[in-house]
Every structure is written in C-alpha cells, then in structure tokens.
Amino acid sequence: NSLFNQEVQIPLTESYCGPCPKNWICYKNNCYQFFDESKNWYESQASCMSQNASLLKVYSKEDQDLLKLVKSYHWMGLVHIPTNGSWQWEDGSILSPNLLTIIEMQKGDCALYASSFKGYIENCSTPNTYICMQRTV
Amino acid sequence: NSLFNQEVQIPLTESYCGPCPKNWICYKNNCYQFFDESKNWYESQASCMSQNASLLKVYSKEDQDLLKLVKSYHWMGLVHIPTNGSWQWEDGSILSPNLLTIIEMQKGDCALYASSFKGYIENCSTPNTYICMQRTV
C-alpha cells in the first residue's frame, strides 16, 4: 500500500450519499432541507420547486426513519383532493395507509409533518416552516 | 448556506456527501446516526467507538444546524472533569463558550444533547438514547 494511492480506498461499509444540493441533508440517498422561514403551503411548495425539489413526501417509515426525531411542525407535500376525498402527494400518488397518523388540527386541505410520522391537517394559507425533499435515483 | 435558509438559495451544483457508514445521515460532510436503544454513557461511547465513530461533538452551530430540530434527549460526548471543573469532549477539547446552554437536570458528569443546542447534565449511569458522529476530512 503506497502512501500516495491513485484511488481513494473507502471501507466496504462506508459510502457516499447523494448527489444533493449543496448543504442539504442526505440520508439513504434522499436529500432533505428544513427551512425556518414561515410561508403558506403554496409559497412553500414554490420554494421547493424553485430548487428542483418538492415538499416532503413520506413514502417509507424505514427509509425515512430520520423523520421520527424531527421537532415541531412543517409543511409537507400532502394535499386533500376535495373531488374524491383522498390525500395525495405532489407527484400525484395517493397517501399509503398506515404511513401517517392524520390528525385534524384545523379545517383545511394541506398537512403539516410532525414527529413520529404524524400529519396535522391545517389551512393551506397558514404560514409554517417547511421541509423540501429531493429523491435521487 | 444554512440548513435553515432565510433566503431560498438555488444551488449551483449538486454534490455527494461523505463517505459515511452505510445508512448514516450525512450533512456538511459529517456523519450522524441516532440510536434508539437506551444505554448508559459508557456503553453508548463504546457503541460509537465500535463503529469508528464517537459520541456527538457539538463544535459549530452553523455547520451542525440540523441539530436545532432534534427531538428528545440523547447522550453526547461531553463529560465533566471534576479536577478542573471543565466540560470536555471525548477528543480532549474543551467545550467552547456559547455553543451549548448547559442545564443541570441531575447531579452528574455526563451530558445529554437536547434541541436548540441545549446540554442537560445527567448521571452517566442513566440509560438514554445516543447520537454517534463521524467527522470526514
């Protein structure tokens, strides 16, 4: 083993995560960013979109177990579709059963993420902090 | 670029983070893992060491702003040195002033990390969850 290896040897158990936008959190090849300016749901969604991301989508308790320990309430990308009564993510997929405990805090069509996989229904016009997410392939 | 951006910065480039142990959180090229089994401080330290890591060291509010939103209490690598009365990290460095608000919850020589950069003094024998950290170069 030369001191000046041409290749960087990474232990088998270690790996790189991403790619993600600079200074985002990377976990299990998904990228997350927490924003602490309060915006309504639409402005929060637009902020994430402007960064080629979307509001948080919860799709797996296992792959997203870091969300268990998140403090406070943050907009996620879940919206109520009045025409069919379902809760839907921005990508058009329907909320899977047993992923989130939905709690009706207010009358509303948007949802806040809270720790331990809870979703609080809230009026979409209410300002809140928000979580953006970018899924990597 | 803070984790809690006051302004939406559109990243010019995307980058990989790490390397980290598989399935650890990577943020600003540091690796973090939250362990939810409760251990005393010494066992927690040994667990991190066995993974080529150490208990959480808080060294920068800016580089570690993801810690602001961590819910609950977790062992970190801060211990009280009775001989000189200082608080010291596992690597021997002294706790920098203004990094943590130290709160005496119990008589003890170990400290729990709590959200918003608070440190709670606790008896080292008390079982708690813990955070391991691995700094990448």
């Epitope: 639409y42 402005e43 969604q45 637009a46 902020s47 979109m49 402007s50 080629n52 919206v79 839907q88 921005e90 990508d91 058009g92 997929s93 899924r135 392939v137 | 939406v8």
Partner: antibody
Framework: EQSGGGAGGGLVKPGGSLELCCKA?????????MSWVRQSPGKGLEWIGR?????????AYASWVNGRFTLSRDIDQSTGCLQLNSLTAADTAMYYC?????????????WGQGTLVTVSS | DIQMTQSPSSVSASVGDRVTITCRAS??????LVWYQQKPGKAPELLMY???TLQSGVPSRFSGSGSGTDFTLTISSLQPEDFATYYC?????????FGQGTKVEIK
C-alpha cells in the same frame, strides 16, 4: 385568454421581437405557475419555461432558450407574458400559455388556445 | 436533461381495440409522469398525472401504470373520439420534457 402582440399579429421578421401575453381567469393565479410550451408545425411539444404566480420571483427556462426569451407576470392582473427576442425561422411555432399544476405531478392542466408565431422575411 | 422516448410513433387500430403506448425516461422519474391527448388543430388536454391518476372527467377506459423509467398508457376499448396523438411528459425536474408523441389512427 391568450393574445399575441406586435406588427402583423404573429408575423415577425428574423432578428425581431414579439411579446405574447395570457390572462388567467376562473382560478387563483397566485397559487399556480404559468408555463409556456411551443409546438412547431407537425412537430412535438417543447417546454420553454415557467414563472410562479405568487409573490416570490421564481422562474426557470429550458437551456436552449439561452436568454432570448423572458417570462414576466402581473399578479394584480393575473397575467403572464413571454417576450421573444432575436427570433429565427426555427422559432416558428404555435405558442401555448399553460397552467402548471404543481400538485398534479407538475402537469399542464389548462392550455390557452395558442398563438401562431411565424418568423419570416 | 431527461429524454422521454415514446413507442410506437404511430399505431393503426379499430374501434373496440385495446391500445398500449409506452414511454421510457432516460433516468428514473419515480411517478412524476403525465399523459396528454391532442386532436388536430387543438391544444393538448391533460389525460392523466402521477403515472396512473386520471384527470377529472377522463373516461375509465384510459389507464396508466409504471414507475421509475418505464410507463404505459392503455386504452382498453378504443372509441371514435380517442383517435388522436398522445404525449408523455416528465415533471420530475426542469427542463420538463415531452415524448415525441404517438399517433393513434383509424385502421
């Protein structure tokens, strides 16, 4: 309602400019994005760019636009415009203003009737 | 940029036939996939989003499936009003890109 301004309606000389505008009605302009999509005769669909209808100034463009086209919007008037500059014959197409629905997979769920832009000397 | 490739480019079919159109993305787009229908001289119309969710008012003979890179639009029993050109589009990242279109013609 979509309209095309400029001399000769949608006819413009190479190197010339044209502004296309679109007024949104029947929905809250501030919670959607306006996008522009063009379709050359007998060809497929090509995305030009998008602009947010809300208070934040968010825009994005296709790379081929190369600074020649500019999106703008007037929130109070619920109007979006596309300024076309340095036009060439390759820009001859039907230009559609569309509502981008960010909650439905970023689909284009409402389309204007389109404005035909012909670039010819 | 993400390339979207549709096949076939055209298909001849009769009323009552089952027609399948495929769309392939050059990289994974999860379920950020949209389908449109365009009739001659008209603007395209949204048919389906999220790879499989029908837009309100679209008949149930249309269905979609797929995730990642491979997607399918199926018309279970072709009706006279379904003869048109169909386009897929990805909404995963900008620039949003369309497939080149599939023309469904009368046999």
């Amino acid at each position: 309602e979509q309209s095309g301004g400029g001399a000769g309606g949608g006819l413009v000389k190479p190197g010339g400019s044209l502004e296309l505008c679109c007024k949104a009605s029947g929905f809250d302009f501030s919670i959607y994005w306006m996008s522009w999509v063009r379709q050359s005769p007998g060809k497929g669909l090509e995305w030009i760019g998008r602009i947010y209808g809300g208070s934040s100034d968010y825009t994005a463009y296709a790379s081929w636009v190369n600074g020649r086209f500019t999106l703008s919007r007037d929130i109070d008037q619920s109007t979006g415009c596309l300024q076309l500059n340095s036009l060439t014959a390759a820009d001859t197409a039907m230009y559609y203003c569309v509502r981008l629905n960010p909650s439905f997979s970023r689909s284009f769920d409402y389309w204007g009737q389109g404005t035909l832009v012909t670039v010819s000397s | 940029d993400i390339q979207m490739t549709q096949s076939p480019s055209s298909v001849s079919a009769s009323v009552g036939d089952r027609v399948t159109i495929t769309c392939r993305a050059s990289q994974g787009i999860f379920s950020w996939l949209v389908w449109y229908q365009q009739k001659p001289g008209k603007a395209p119309e949204l048919l389906m989003y999220g790879a499989s969710t029908l837009q309100s008012g679209v008949p149930s003979r249309f269905s979609g499936s797929g995730s990642g890179t491979d997607f399918t639009l199926t018309i279970s029993s072709l009706q006279p009003e379904d003869f048109a050109t169909y386009y897929c589009q990805q909404g995963y990242s900008t620039p949003y890109t369309f497939g080149q279109g599939t023309k469904v013609e009368i046999k």
